[in-house]
């Protein structure tokens, strides 16, 4: 019951996280102007992956994309890059994840598929968020670089004479959605791991203990029945699945492939 | 048809204070910021205060700042500039103006109201 | 403050012709987030208030005759009427709507020969 609640929060987590990156990666609010100490300009700048935006003081917003490929930043181009690999990676893990999911039943598959598509998927959520984090990341370096950069310089001089205006850009809601997408990316990826270790059948050699009592032998191993048929049924080197809970045998038992999460 | 009707001056002493209306009609009041633009006889124009519709940014120019504070009413569609400290140099035609939608443009102007700052 | 500079202060023409009057800014008006300048131009009859007639330094306001156009990109901008007509007797202000305080012009006065 802990795995599949385990599991199921996973993926909820996990989700939640990669529509937040998805989200992220859509808005167009990575870097807004900056008011303080700044000229007060009658229209705010914001700045996206994709495009950057102006308002006027009247409301109008009126965006343009960026139309070249070449000629954007390489910081940037990396930013959207990890963006998207998160996307990628996320949707994939999603989809496996959903045939992962212990409370759903597809055919005959076996709990040692199911627990190798957990991991996989884990494996997927947590350099989803890692590369959301990573990406909203060198991005706001990248914006704290250039925000010292601007205000050593408020006004860059063109020609001597003539002054442009240096807009300063900081944070944008963008850069918290993502840092928090990807958080909850690599936590939901860290539980499906987690559950994946309770779905993992164990290829264990149980010392069985005889008892005797009342004239007729009963083998009894601790923690071990939650799974099985009968008390005597689990004397034989047979798969079980134990929700989790690992006695001391369990943890001298020969290593599964699943044990180095 | 948009209407701005401007109400309020005529002759003040110097240092003395004025209260300028500005009556609107014909669209959205709460929806457009305003301006309040002022004209020296024979001179050009000079802006003098901005307030956005919902009142959260209001700017002045430099030479009325402190003295000058433009307000207003969206329930009775009405802008205001409250003018104290009055000088000389403030004589002129005050213009009450709504901002544009596009490109922050002063697209309407009412007929003005004249101050006259004079001992 | 940015400041706005008209020229010339006053020109005189015959109906017909085709006008030019500049508009120069100490800063550039140019907002790279959307390509826009902002800058605007204002035409004031005797006895009236001001009418809007460009926004963005090129795009005519509505209502405002096709004879009007502007031009120009970051601190230098032009108004040009291409056939001047008996009602463009004006003075012609043009207005920094980037920058607050939103500075004007001194206006260049056309009149008629």
């Known amino acids: 019951m802990a795995v599949t609640a385990c599991q199921g929060l996973g993926f909820v987590v996990s989700l939640i996280g990669i529509a937040g990156i998805i989200a992220a990666t859509c808005m167009d609010q990575w870097s807004t102007q900056d008011l303080y100490n700044n000229p007060v300009t009658a229209v705010f700048n914001y700045q996206g992956l994709w495009r950057s935006c102006v308002r006027e003081s009247s409301g109008f917003t009126e965006c343009r994309g960026y139309f070249t490929l070449l000629g954007l930043p390489a910081m940037l181009q990396a930013v959207r890059a990890l963006m998207i690999v998160g996307i990628v990676l996320g949707a994939i893990g999603l989809l496996v994840s959903i045939f992962a999911l212990k409370c759903i039943r597809i055919g005959s598959m076996e709990d040692s598929a199911k627990a190798n598509m957990t991991l996989t998927s884990g494996i997927m959520f947590i350099v989803s968020g890692l590369c959301a984090i990573a990406g909203v990341s060198v991005f706001a370096n990248m914006l704290v670089t250039n925000f010292w950069m601007s205000t050593a310089n408020m006004y860059t001089g063109m020609g001597g004479m003539v002054q442009t205006v240096q807009t300063r850009y900081t944070f944008g809601a963008a850069l918290f959605v993502g840092w928090v997408a990807g958080g909850l990316t690599l936590i939901g990826g860290v539980m499906m791991c987690i559950a994946c270790r309770g779905l993992a059948p164990e290829e264990t050699n149980y010392k069985a203990v005889s008892y005797h009592a009342s004239g007729h032998s009963v083998a009894y191993k601790p923690g071990g029945f939650k799974a099985s048929t009968g008390f005597g049924s689990n004397t034989k080197n047979k798969k079980i699945y134990d929700g989790g809970a690992r006695t001391e045998d369990e943890v001298q038992s020969y290593p599964s492939k699943h044990d180095y999460v | 048809e948009v209407q701005l009707v401007e109400s309020g001056g005529g002759l003040v002493q110097p240092g003395g204070s004025l209260r300028l209306s500005c009556a609107v009609s014909?669209?959205?009041?709460?929806?457009?910021?305003m301006h309040w633009v002022r004209q020296a006889p024979g001179k050009g124009l000079e802006w003098v205060a901005y307030?956005?519709?919902?009142?959260?940014?209001?700017y002045y120019a430099d030479s009325v700042k402190g003295r000058f504070t433009v307000s207003r009413d969206n329930a009775k569609n009405s802008l205001y500039l409250q003018m104290n400290s009055l000088r000389a140099e403030d004589t002129a035609v005050y213009y009450c103006?709504?901002?544009?939608?596009?490109?922050?443009?002063?697209?309407?102007w009412g007929q003005g109201t004249l101050v006259t700052v004079s001992s | 403050d940015i400041v706005m500079t008209q020229s010339p202060d006053s020109l005189a023409v015959s109906l017909g012709e085709r006008v030019t009057m500049n508009c120069k800014s100490s800063?550039?008006?140019?907002?790279?987030?959307?390509?826009?300048?902002?800058l605007t131009w204002y035409q004031q009859k005797p006895g009236q208030p001001p009418k809007l007639l460009i926004y963005w330094a090129s795009t005519r306001e509505s209502g405002v005759p096709d004879r009007f156009s502007g031009s120009g990109s970051g601190t230098d901008f032009t108004l040009t009427i291409s056939s001047v007509q008996a009602e463009d007797v004006a003075v012609y202000y043009c207005?920094?709507?980037?920058?607050?305080?939103?500075?004007f012009g001194q206006g260049t006065k056309l009149e008629i020969k």
């Open positions: 014909g669209f959205t009041f709460s929806s457009f910021g």
């Open positions: 800063q550039s008006l140019f907002q790279s987030g959307n390509q826009r300048n902002y």
């Open positions: 307030i956005s519709s919902g009142t959260t940014n209001i």
């Open positions: 207005q920094n709507v980037y920058i607050y305080p939103l500075t």
């Open positions: 103006v709504r901002s544009g939608y596009y490109g922050n443009s002063l697209d309407y």
